[in-house]
């Protein structure tokens, strides 16, 4: 197959592929907001076999504007073509296409996490799915950012094996009675733009010395 992707602006929809909780999620938006489909059907093929366009079963006649393609898109070495059809009843309102290389086009959403503050350290508990397919690891590394009083420190914990199950990291040597904020994200080896999680903040409890000083008052 051959394909060209010129910089045209009249494609009727825009697509985005994201790794969300280690699931490949394709989402789309319509450029023309006067078109209001009642449902969509998503089809795809691989670049090398464009005539083999097939319907994504769980995204046929769907009312959602996203589709989980984890079980369909396995290869980071293949280019995929997506075709979206929008309908109102039985009438096709539009059809549009986009070309994806997962390794290039995938954006990596941050994992869920919780923090618990102690006197001089913070436990960061990162939640990964219990099982993550090998091909969805994407040579990702976990980054935990610690912020306090305008200073940002990056932590890159080494994760043995693959990113699955819950993972706990301890940020230590912290100052008691100080506010710390933490963000986590996944960093790709290709230095793609990262999506950082919203900050979660905690005020560490005072240490023993300040506690005794308080009680002396």
């Amino acid at each position: 197959i051959s394909y060209d992707s010129p910089d045209y602006t009249d494609e009727s929809c825009t697509f985005k592929i994201s790794l969300r909780n280690f699931r490949s999620i394709l989402s789309w938006e319509l450029k023309n907001h006067s078109i209001v489909p009642t449902h969509y059907t998503l089809l795809y093929t691989i670049m090398s076999k464009p005539e083999d366009l097939k319907v994504v079963k769980n995204c046929a006649n769907t009312t959602r504007s996203f589709c989980d393609l984890t079980d369909e898109w396995r290869s980071t070495h293949e280019a995929y073509v997506t075709v979206l059809e929008g309908f109102s009843g039985n009438t096709t309102l539009f059809s549009c296409s986009h070309n994806f290389w997962l390794a290039i086009d995938m954006s990596f959403e941050p994992p869920e996490f919780e923090i618990v503050g102690f006197t001089n350290h913070i436990n960061v508990m990162v939640k990964f799915p219990s099982i993550v397919e090998e091909e969805l690891q994407f040579d990702l590394s976990l980054v935990i950012e610690e912020q306090s009083e305008g200073i940002v420190k990056k932590h890159k914990p080494e994760i043995k094996g693959n990113m699955s199950g819950n993972f706990t990291y301890i940020i230590d040597k912290l100052i008691p009675n100080t506010n710390y904020c933490v963000s986590v994200y996944l960093e790709h080896s290709d230095e793609q733009a990262v999506i950082k999680s919203p900050l979660k903040c905690t005020l560490l409890p005072p240490g023993q010395e300040s506690e005794s000083a308080e009680s002396a008052k």
Epitope: S2, Y3, D4, S5, P6, Y8, T9, D10, E11, S12, N32, I35, L43, E51, L53, V55, V83, E85, T92, L93, F94, S95, C96, S97, H98, N99
Partner: nanobody, 119 residues
Framework: QVQLQESGGGSVQPGGSLRLSCAAS????????MSWVRQAPGKGLEWVSA???????YYTDSVKGRFTISRDNAKNTLYLQLNSLKTEDTAMYYC?????????????PGQGTQVTVSS
């Protein structure tokens, strides 16, 4: 309703060229992927090429590098430039709304345009 009118076919010798056109009406042309499909004598319909409203183009391997699909959204017209024609390109050529898929898509509504390649 959707109307598609193909033209530009003819008889040429191997290695020759033709330019097919498809005039579309009855729908917002730029909102749709458009396809070219063909039917060789005694065979079923075969997908040849597709182009999105934004200009992404796709070709089956047998025509790659020889055929070029294009569109003019202002004129509601789809084109297929056929170069380096081979005898196996002999077929009736049809344009179709959306990406045509065998077994899923309806037969193209137009009359088609005949391309004959022979020496």
């Amino acid at each position: 309703q959707v109307q598609l009118q193909e033209s530009g076919g003819g008889s040429v010798q191997p290695g020759g060229s033709l330019r097919l056109s498809c005039a579309a009406s009855g729908f917002t042309f730029s909102n749709y992927i458009m396809s070219w499909v063909r039917q060789a004598p005694g065979k079923g319909l075969e997908w040849v090429s597709a182009i999105s409203g934004g200009g992404n183009t796709y070709y089956t391997d047998s025509v790659k590098g020889r055929f070029t699909i294009s569109r003019d959204n202002a004129k509601n017209t789809l084109y297929l430039q056929l170069n380096s024609l081979k005898t196996e390109d002999t077929a009736m050529y049809y344009c179709a709304q959306n990406w045509w898929v065998a077994g899923r898509s309806p037969n193209p509504p137009g009359q088609g345009t005949q391309v004959t390649v022979s020496s």
